[in-house]
Interface confidence: low
């Protein structure tokens, strides 16, 4: 907006109240201890047009509606949405004075949502889409993801639940070792009318710590007129791509699909290779011929003991007093090792070792050569699928009026902040700066260069 | 290893109740929900019911609904479902199910990866 | 009757390619997700297919599932003498509220 150049010398001017040099408790009495940097909160305002705002900093709910709708897919007593919501600071705020809106309860379902300042209409503005999320205590099972919900004229936000029609779902998602950041837009088939969810592909990037690491971390969903799509962590790209190519199902179905009244011909020949059919048995191959013969070229060891056995009665043996010939039939002593074989090479019959045939050569098989029938794997005929639509211009998807939060977790204290949702990435960008920049800025502030950074961060303003 | 382990066989005769367990290890059962399918002889699929581990909260199938009660003992981490007024067209084999994956709508409550054995329950005067 | 309908037979021969359809309304395949489920005799169903076309890790992508409008489909491509078993569709129905299957399709793999 015009007034756009005037805001870089107020956020400067800003910046001095922001960063201001305290000396702690120890300083005062070690002049050798430099003063720490502290920031100070002040609460982002909108540098343009808006459709959608809230920093939470009133210290109030109002503008959220909370949901007394029943869930529709449990028992009446047990499916309200009973999960309590509170804006407060967080736990370990380093920025008193910075509200949010915090999940407070575990293992309920959560509802609340709020009216945009007007729809967004998909046209020719691009849609971005940004708030921050502090799992202050952790996630074990549960989403912060949001909902922009459907401009239909049903829609009524005191009865918002889980199926309340949405046109665009975004956001973070974890339960066990699955972490999730959720992109999903319903589309609606243009042939049928009937919406279908569209997932985008999962992001390369490790999403784990932004999960675990107890840091806000800022989420943001930027969706262009030419279809493409962009989601940042902290600023940071961690997955893009295009409506029309990288999404599940596929915005667009195949143009063709297999015939399903197609059949394989009964004589298609799907056989690469067969057996020669001109081949013939050689006359010298002995197909009876064993794989194994006794080694002819052995001698018997010296020393073998022919007449020995291996195994002989055990001579300290005795019969037990109490064996019965009748019942227990004609006592034998148990067998032991011969110990005349222990210094011998070998006791007993002397067999030849077996060795391979030099002759064998089992069963003839006709070798394989190139099935001059072969057609190929047969694949039935592709057809015009019936079903065929092509929506080339999928950004246009169903305008939405209301923002919403229905969740469920099994973990307390999740904190909201800085919701924000405009058609101008500059605006989205200084709110961002100016309110999860802060917090970024305090969970830093003992580290050199975090107030150059700042400053640096208000000059690059146009 | 994740699995799901059912009580044994049971023979009852009309009119009374059954009460099936499901013993689940190897995950967070309070992070699942679980449901439990039947299939009489010869016949296809029925769905139940469901249970959601983490709160316990519960729903039914229209066609069951006053006769099943579905349970659960987080520190047993075990689910009960328990079918009351048997009949003979009763006589089924009852299996727990868990989902694939997580306790919301759009986490799709019909995608079962986890199965019971399987619990034969007959009905017969 | 099943809310999903299904063939009751499909059959097809070593290397083949075969396809289940199964058929529903806006209230259940029209609106929700489609799942399938492989059972072999005297075991507990195998989820083969999850959101209409997605597999589940270690199942082979000889399946493949699909879905258009009402109706659902199930494909085996290079078709085996183990993938002998009854097939099952699935979905939740809204006028319901509930998860209806369908009556199964045995599949036969001939010679």
């Known amino acids: 907006h015009d007034g756009h150049d005037d805001d870089a010398i107020d956020i400067e001017d800003d910046l001095d109240d922001v960063i201001e040099e305290v000396e702690d408790s120890k300083s005062k009495s070690d002049a050798s201890t430099p003063p720490s940097p502290k920031v100070t909160y002040k609460a982002p305002v909108p540098t343009g047009e808006v459709y959608f705002a809230d920093s939470f900093d009133r210290g109030s709910l109002s503008g959220w509606i909370l949901s007394k709708a029943k869930k529709d897919d449990t028992d009446d007593e047990i499916a309200k949405y009973d999960g309590k919501w509170e804006v407060d600071e967080m736990k370990e705020t380093k920025l008193p004075g910075d509200k949010g809106l915090v999940l407070m309860s575990r293992a309920k379902h959560h509802a609340i949502s709020a009216k945009l300042n007007k729809p967004f209409l998909f046209d020719t503005k691009p849609l971005i889409v940004q708030y921050e999320v502090n799992f202050q205590n952790g996630i074990e099972c549960g989403g912060a993801y949001v909902k922009l919900l459907s401009k239909t004229a049903e829609l009524s936000l005191d009865q918002f639940h889980d199926k309340t029609p949405y046109t665009i779902m975004f956001g973070p998602d974890k339960c066990g070792e699955d972490y999730k950041l959720h992109f999903i837009f319903r589309h609606k088939n243009p042939k049928t009318g009937v919406y279908e969810e569209k997932h985008a592909k999962r992001p390369d990037a490790d999403l784990k710590t932004y999960f675990t690491d107890k840091k806000t971390h800022l989420y943001t969903l930027i969706l262009n007129p030419d279809n493409s799509f962009e989601i940042l962590v902290d600023q940071s790209v961690v997955n893009s791509g295009n409506l029309l190519n990288d999404m599940t199902p596929p915005v667009n179905p195949s143009r063709e699909i297999e015939d399903p009244e197609d059949r394989k011909p009964e004589d298609w020949d799907e056989r690469p290779k067969i057996a020669d059919p001109d081949a013939v048995k050689p006359d010298d191959w002995d197909e009876d011929a064993p794989s194994k013969i006794p080694d002819e070229e052995a001698t018997k060891p010296e020393g073998w003991l022919d007449d020995e056995p291996e195994y002989i009665p055990d001579p300290d043996a005795e019969k037990p007093e109490d064996w019965d010939e009748d019942m227990d039939g004609e006592w034998e002593a148990p067998q032991i090792a011969n110990p005349k074989c222990e210094s011998a090479p070998g006791c007993g019959v002397w067999q030849r070792p077996m060795i391979d045939n030099p002759n064998y050569k089992g069963k003839w098989k006709p070798p394989m050569i190139d099935n001059p029938n072969y057609q190929g794997i047969w694949k039935p005929r592709k057809i015009p699928n019936p079903d065929f639509f092509e929506d080339l211009e999928p950004f246009k998807m169903t305008p939405f009026s209301a923002i919403g939060l229905e969740l469920w977790s099994m973990t307390s204290d999740i904190f909201f902040d800085n919701f924000i949702i405009s058609g101008d990435r500059r605006v989205v960008d200084d709110w961002a700066n100016d309110g999860w920049g802060l917090k970024k800025a305090a969970d830093g502030a003992a580290e050199p260069g975090v107030v150059l950074q700042m400053l640096e961060a208000a000059e690059e303003r146009p | 290893e994740v699995q799901l382990v059912q009580s044994g066989a049971e023979v009852k005769k009309p009119g009374a109740s059954v009460k099936v367990s499901c013993k689940a290890s190897g995950y967070t059962f309070t992070s699942y929900a679980m449901h439990w399918v039947r299939q009489a002889p010869g016949q296809r699929l029925e769905w139940m019911g469901w249970i959601n581990a983490g709160n316990g909260n519960t729903k039914y199938s229209q066609k069951f609904q006053g006769r099943v009660t579905i349970t659960r003992d987080t520190s047993a981490s075990t689910a009960y479902m328990e079918l009351s007024s048997l009949r003979s067209e009763d006589t089924a084999v009852y299996y727990c199910a868990r989902v694939l994956h997580v306790l919301r709508y759009f986490d799709w409550p019909g995608a079962f990866d986890i199965w019971g054995q399987g619990t034969t329950v007959t009905v017969s005067s | 009757q099943s809310v999903l309908t299904q063939p009751p037979s499909a059959s097809g021969t070593p290397g083949q390619r075969v396809t289940i359809s199964c058929s529903g309304s806006s209230s259940n395949i029209g609106t929700n997700y489609v799942y399938w489920y492989q059972q072999l005799p005297g075991t507990a169903p195998k989820l083969l297919i999850y959101?209409?076309?997605q597999r589940p890790s270690g199942v082979p992508d000889r399946f493949s599932g699909s879905k258009s409008g009402t109706s659902a489909s199930l494909a085996l491509s290079g078709l085996r003498s183990e993938d002998e078993a009854d097939y099952y569709c699935a979905a939740w129905d809204d006028s319901l509220s509930g998860l209806v299957f369908g009556g199964g399709t045995k599949l036969t793999v001939l010679g």
């Open positions: 959101i209409n076309d």
